[in-house]
Interface confidence: low
């Protein structure tokens, strides 16, 4: 039975130019975790992995960051970057669990972080 | 805040055992490797093992396999290293180390001195 | 076992100086080396992990890079609280291995 649940950075918005911090956490499950992706849409961002730690994604590799923790740093966002992602936790024994982060990259400085929710 | 408190100092004669611990908090215990590491004058930093917490699952460096045994307490949240037929060549301090694709956070050290 | 030679083993330099420490992997790594900073009270700080991926809260004063099998941790100005000893790990394959340390003092 999956008795955890994912805490993400909810909804949240950030200015063109900048960067930003994507950030989610498994609680309440004593599962393994064995690797982390992060994706956006039906692209590959990121992978960490926990003999080998990260990776990134060629195509990524000059705009994203791996960390802080199992999080990812976006940075240099433009309108395009506006669009859910996805933290996809692969543990043992439970399976996957799945977090929703909505960005959206505005034009002027009304960026404002969103409040935190829960996915079970 | 991720935390690993090691137990004290340890003071034991030669052929004897020691039972080192590492209590974390923080984080979900299981879903973490838990590392242990050896940092002595002669040999500088060495690898002693590795625990899956979430199984009890261990990898040794062979060079440790007859000498540590790693175990852990997952109602406690307390990881554990026990070194046999101690020497003085146990003399160090030793080092427990959250691991999830790397070593992302170490306790404060246990120093071992054996001497009769 | 994976041999890691780090060089040098002790380093005396000035504050601002730009310094740079070195390991030699003895196979092949692929870029999983972390470097980490070890103070005198015997606190151990993780601050490149993947090569040069800085963790979260080390200053951009430090960077790492790899030239083949060898791997650099550069301090491009250095600062008070940088003198300490550091090392390499490698963590490819079991056993991880460290190289024996840099003592970087303050001259």
């Known amino acids: 039975m999956m008795t955890g649940t994912i805490e993400t950075t909810g909804n949240i918005s950030a200015e063109k130019g900048g960067s930003i911090i994507l950030q989610c956490h498994l609680s309440s499950t004593t599962a393994q975790v064995t690797q982390v992706n992060w994706e956006q849409q039906d692209q590959l961002l990121a992978i960490c992995n926990a003999d080998l730690g990260w990776h990134i994604s060629p195509s990524f590799k000059d705009r994203v960051a791996p960390g802080p923790g199992l999080g990812l740093t976006l940075q240099s966002l433009t309108v395009n970057d506006t669009g859910e992602y996805f933290c996809i936790y692969h543990t043992y024994p439970d399976g996957t669990y799945t977090g929703r982060i909505f960005l959206e990259v505005l034009e002027s400085s009304v960026a404002e972080h969103g409040a935190r929710f829960q996915i079970p | 805040e991720v935390q690993l408190q090691e137990s004290g100092p340890e003071l034991v004669k030669p052929g004897a055992s020691v039972k080192i611990s590492c209590k974390a908090s923080?984080?979900?215990?299981?879903?973490?490797?838990m590392l242990w590491v050896k940092q002595s004058h002669v040999k500088s930093l060495e690898w002693i093992g590795r625990?899956?917490?979430?199984?009890?699952?261990?990898t040794y460096n062979q060079n440790f396999k007859d000498k540590a045994s790693l175990t852990v307490n997952k109602s406690s949240s307390t990881a554990y290293m026990e070194l046999h037929s101690l020497t003085s060549e146990d003399s160090a301090v030793y080092y427990c180390?959250?691991?999830?694709?790397?070593?992302?956070?170490w306790g404060q050290g246990t120093t071992l001195t054996v001497s009769s | 076992d994976i041999q890691m030679t780090q060089s040098p083993s002790s380093l005396s330099a000035s504050l601002g100086e730009r310094v740079s420490l070195t390991c030699r992997a003895s196979q092949e790594i692929s870029g999983y080396l972390s470097w980490l900073q070890q103070k005198p009270d015997g606190t151990i700080k993780r601050l490149i992990y993947?090569?040069?991926t800085l963790d979260s809260g080390v200053p951009k004063r430090f960077s790492g890079s790899r030239s083949g099998s060898d791997y650099s941790l550069t301090i491009s100005s250095l600062e008070s609280e940088d003198f300490a000893d550091y090392y390499c790990l490698q963590y490819a394959s079991y056993p991880f291995t460290f190289g024996s340390g840099t003592k970087l003092e303050i001259k």
């Open positions: 180390a959250r691991w999830f694709g790397d070593f992302d956070f």
């Open positions: 923080g984080y979900s215990f299981t879903g973490y490797y």
């Open positions: 993947a090569t040069s």
């Open positions: 625990i899956n917490p979430y199984n009890g699952a261990t």
